[in-house]
């Protein structure tokens, strides 16, 4: 008498998620009576898949009629399959007795699940940092299936090549997730600057998938100061300017000092922007020279976005030989940041 | 080439728990049953249990109060916590794989991690 | 439980010659599928135990050819043909048909 063989054609199968699966199998003997039972795994923790005689299978379907005589297939279909479905599922026949005896498996089909990468997800560095600096951002995808994935970091279209990528688990899994850090040096010009990370697998049929991050969350970029004086006014006032250009973002307050004392503080706010994403804020100060016997020291004094200050000094020199009404006063730019303004006294 | 390494305490309090980890590198954790076995100083191997990559776990009905066996497929690890320790389980604990290729049986533990002492002692 | 009984528990051996362990089990280890879920393993001075024979007589990966299993049932037997000094180490018998897996007493072969 010829051996009784079960058989599962397929090594392995593989299934979209969301669709059937069919695993094959059939026996090549009718003897000796007795039922087919479905697995997944091996071992005491297998769990049964299929039983036909009894139990609840609502996802399960015999592809064959399994009651009519002589049916040698006992191929079955699992629908709406997931990810947690993949596995190897072995096809056992039992000897008919009490209880049945298990006679023989197949050698086991492996059905793995092709699922789709959830949208990656950037996230840029914690705290801002200046141009010249290098910051970094993480893009992050999960859930999908087989292990196999491309990802690619572009900066405004270019492609970027100082990033580092993590497929896990380093295993067979039932899903994956995949963990890249790219590197990105900032420039002053970034403020409107856009990491992309892309995606490409198997299950997005060419179409790859994209997370980007805007650099102006991760970017400051310091203001400059200009201190200068506009103009001597018929009243022996000098119209003192601080100019703060080219800085982001706009949280920025600023102090004026007059020989160290606060004169007055500003907070910058609804400033237009710059084509480049910076902007420029100006705030004058108007200092009465005939009020004052000695030199007058002004101070522009600039916070940015929580940063150390920065200042800007003048030095308003009160002289017996007042210059004519009306005229600019160059200033001279000395090695301490201070200019000098010669303001006529009367 | 599946590497195994278990990792934790080398001494622990006499009624106190005991906690394990074993690192899977090289492999995967899927299709095998992952195993603890002890060996006490110059006697033989006392298997405590193992999980399946399903979750399913199986214990020695002896320590199955005590014992509980979890799996961290994210990490590639699985653990042992052993509560209520005493000098009987001061051993050499090795993590190990189990294969199974079908069928209700077993088909060997292949691979073992190089074992790490624990004493139980105050 | 499964039992597992192994004779001798010391075993002197000459290099070269060789040398023969047995492991009866208080239960069949014969499934009904044919398979015979019984392993050896040897674990050499100091070091992790590591399997040699799993199912009855199947050689594990890289294990050389001097050492065979046979046996079914209850009753088996683990032979190395030629005897080599690197063989020193305690062998254990184990059964796989069913938790709690069990492990025979150990057999400690040295060179006489």
């Known amino acids: 008498e010829e051996e009784l063989q079960v058989i599962q054609p397929e090594k392995s199968v593989s299934v979209a998620a969301g669709d059937s699966a069919t695993l094959n199998c059939t026996v090549s003997s009718l003897i000796p009576v007795g039922p087919i039972q479905w697995f997944r795994g091996a071992g005491p923790g297998r769990e049964l898949i299929y039983n036909l005689k009894e139990g609840h299978f609502p996802r399960v379907t015999p592809v064959s009629d399994p009651t009519k005589r002589n049916n040698m297939d006992f191929s079955i279909r699992i629908s709406n399959i997931t990810p947690a479905d993949a596995g190897t599922y072995y096809c056992v026949k039992f000897r008919k007795g009490s209880p049945d005896v298990e006679l023989k498996s197949g050698a086991g089909t492996e059905l793995s699940v092709r699922a789709k990468p959830s949208a990656p997800v950037v996230s840029g560095p914690a705290v801002r940092a200046t141009a010249e600096h290098t910051v970094s951002f993480t893009c992050e995808s999960h859930g999908f299936s087989p292990r196999d994935i491309t990802l690619k970091w572009f900066k405004n279209g270019n492609e970027l090549s100082d990033f580092q990528t993590n497929v896990d688990p380093a295993g067979k899994s039932v899903s994956y997730s995949i963990r890249s850090t790219a590197r990105v040096v900032l420039t002053r010009r970034d403020v409107h600057s856009q990491v992309i990370c892309e995606v490409a697998h198997v299950t997005l049929q060419g179409d790859p998938l994209r997370g980007t991050a805007n650099l102006s969350e991760a970017i400051r970029v310091p203001p400059f100061l200009e201190v200068t004086q506009q103009s001597m006014r018929a009243d022996n006032q000098v119209n003192v300017t601080c100019q703060v250009t080219k800085f982001y973002p706009q949280r920025l307050q600023l102090t004026w000092l007059e020989n160290g004392n606060v004169s007055r503080t500003e907070m910058a706010s609804a400033l237009p922007e710059n084509k480049d994403g910076t902007y420029n804020w100006t705030s004058w100060l108007l200092v009465n020279v005939s009020a004052h016997r000695d030199d007058v020291k002004l101070t522009c004094q600039v916070e940015h976005d929580g940063q150390p200050a920065v200042n800007k000094s003048f030095s308003v020199k009160v002289s017996a030989h007042p210059k004519e009404q009306g005229s600019n006063t160059a200033a001279e730019n000395t090695g301490t940041n201070e200019r000098n303004i010669y303001g006529g006294s009367g | 080439q599946v590497q195994l390494q278990e990792s934790g305490p080398g001494l622990v309090k006499p009624s106190e728990t005991l906690s394990l980890t074993c690192t899977v590198s090289?492999?995967?954790?899927?299709?095998?049953?992952w195993s603890w076995i002890r060996q006490p100083p110059g006697k033989g191997l006392e298997w405590i249990g193992f999980?399946?990559?399903?979750?399913?776990?199986f214990y020695q009905s002896s320590l199955k109060s005590r014992v509980t066996i979890s799996l961290d497929t994210s990490k590639n690890q699985f653990s042992l916590k052993m509560t209520s320790v005493t000098a009987a389980d001061t051993a050499v604990y090795y993590c190990?794989?189990?294969?199974?290729?079908?069928?209700?049986?077993?088909?060997?533990?292949?691979?073992w991690g190089q074992g790490t002492t624990v004493t139980v002692s105050s | 439980d499964i039992v597992m009984t192994q004779s001798p528990l010391s075993l002197p051996v000459t290099p070269g010659e060789p040398a023969s362990i047995s492991c009866r089990s208080s239960?069949?280890?014969?499934?009904?599928?044919?398979?015979?879920?019984l392993d050896w393993y040897l674990q050499r001075p100091g070091q992790s135990p590591q399997l040699l024979i799993y199912?009855?007589?199947s050689r594990a990966s890289g294990v050389p050819d001097r050492f065979s299993g046979s046996g079914s049932g209850t009753d088996f037997t683990l032979k190395i043909s030629r005897v080599e000094a690197e063989d020193v180490g305690v062998f254990y018998c184990?059964?796989?048909?069913?938790?709690?897996?069990?492990f025979g007493q150990g057999t400690k072969v040295e060179i006489k």
């Open positions: 190990a794989r189990v294969r199974a290729y079908s069928g209700i049986g077993l088909d060997g533990t292949d691979v």
């Open positions: 090289g492999g995967s954790i899927r299709d095998y049953y």
């Open positions: 999980i399946y990559y399903n979750g399913r776990t």
């Open positions: 239960q069949s280890l014969l499934y009904s599928t044919g398979y015979t879920y």
């Open positions: 199912g009855g007589s």
């Open positions: 184990g059964q796989a048909l069913q938790t709690p897996l069990t």
